[in-house]
Interface confidence: low
């Protein structure tokens, strides 16, 4: 008799999830010598242990603590780049500017990037059919709790000047409900972080507006200032040129406004 399975509103666990996580871990530890000591089988076991046999709407940060411990990593805390709704450009940037790091440049972020996963209560099965949607089903699902946990830790680790890349093409350039707005902003430590500098990325070719004056950016500035952290903002009018100039800063065209 086929067992009744809860139907959730979100997509199911990514195909070949265990193999993907293990393969990514092996690849990451090969590329990053400082993480060569990591035992990827133990990492997978800890990852699996966070959600297998647990109700996928009842996951806690504590469930992920064994994984967090195994994934502890030293990142220069003054080289952190946060992002919101503009992941691809942020990743392109850190691929060029190798001494800066997004969350997905760390082991734990790299393992989970773009993946979905969940289990079922009281069974060791992974649910490949459906997983809870954050809005329609529940917020304490395995994926959301994972990103909340690693994002909080990443923000807590930051120091000096922290940069955040924001999407200037969106109606809410700064969104209080994004991971950046709801988790990272509130976990920057004023005793370590001097300034949050926002880079607002323009989408349109002819867009010369000062998006740093956008009401949502003013809202971000207000939140940050109340936390005793200085705020600054820069318009990146030409993201293509911006990346090009990061690659080749000596280029004569890079002295003009980007």
């Amino acid at each position: 008799v086929p067992r009744w399975r809860q139907q959730w509103s979100g997509p199911g666990t990514t195909k070949r999830f265990p193999e993907t996580v293990l393969a990514r871990c092996v690849k990451y530890t090969e590329i990053h010598p400082e993480m060569r000591h990591v035992d990827c089988q133990s990492v997978w076991d800890a990852f699996k242990g966070a959600f297998i046999s647990k109700h996928p709407c009842n996951i806690t940060e504590e469930d992920y603590q064994p994984l967090m411990k195994l994934g502890t990593q030293t990142v220069p805390c003054n080289k952190i780049l946060l992002w919101s709704r503009i992941k691809d450009l942020a990743h392109q940037f850190t691929q060029v500017q190798r001494d800066m790091f997004t969350l997905e440049d760390t082991l734990l972020g790299y393992l989970a990037d773009d993946l979905t996963w969940c289990g079922e209560f009281n069974t060791s099965k992974i649910n490949y059919q459906s997983c809870p949607d954050w809005r329609k089903d529940c917020s304490n699902n395995p994926v959301s709790v994972f990103w909340k946990t690693v994002s909080r830790r990443f923000a807590e680790a930051a120091c000096d000047v922290v940069h955040v890349m924001l999407n200037g093409s969106r109606s809410k350039i700064f969104d209080k409900n994004s991971t950046f707005g709801s988790v990272e902003v509130h976990n920057l430590q004023p005793e370590k972080v001097q300034t949050l500098e926002a880079w607002v990325i323009h989408g349109g070719r002819e867009d010369s507006r000062d998006l740093c004056q956008d009401p949502t950016i003013k809202e971000l500035e207000s939140i940050i200032s109340k936390r005793n952290i200085q705020f600054s903002c820069k318009n990146i009018y030409r993201p293509d040129k911006f990346l090009q100039c990061v690659k080749n800063p000596e280029d004569s065209s890079c002295t003009s406004e980007i």
Partner: nanobody, 124 residues
Framework: QLQLQESGPGLVKPSETLSLTCTVS??????????WGWIRQPPGKGLEWIGS???????NYNPSLKSRVTISVDTSKNQLSLKLSSVTAADTAVYYC????????????????RGQGTLVTVSS
């Protein structure tokens, strides 16, 4: 390995200014690798961050103490100093000088490096 040593009077009168110095050895206080700060622990309570100073010279202070605190560095002596004005009995605490390492592991602040602490009692 960085070592930090606090020094200053153990007894301060109410309404006076508390002045402490921290001598750093094993590393340069002006190095961009580190940031510095002061924390304190009142008797029977938890640690409280007082403020931090960066290699650029800019400072950040605990909002509740901001109006009374000054943190500065003397690079020639490799020293960090704390001045807390208009003290009251509520400022009685063990005061620690602390250093953060930009390349240190996640979540260690404010105790990457910390002095032994010095007890300051505010009393007439």
């Amino acid at each position: 390995q960085l070592q930090l040593q606090e020094s200053g009077p153990g007894l301060v009168k109410p309404s006076e200014t508390l002045s402490l110095t921290c001598t750093v050895s094993g590393g340069s206080i002006s190095s961009s690798r580190y940031y510095w700060g002061w924390i304190r622990q009142p008797p029977g309570k938890g640690l409280e961050w007082i403020g931090s100073i960066y290699y650029s010279g800019s400072t950040n202070y605990n909002p509740s103490l901001k109006s009374r605190v000054t943190i500065s560095v003397d690079t020639s002596k490799n020293q960090l100093s704390l001045k807390l004005s208009s003290v009251t009995a509520a400022d009685t605490a063990v005061y620690y000088c602390a250093g953060g390492d930009r390349y240190g592991p996640v979540g260690q602040w404010p105790s990457d490096y910390r002095g032994q602490g010095t007890l300051v009692t505010v009393s007439s």
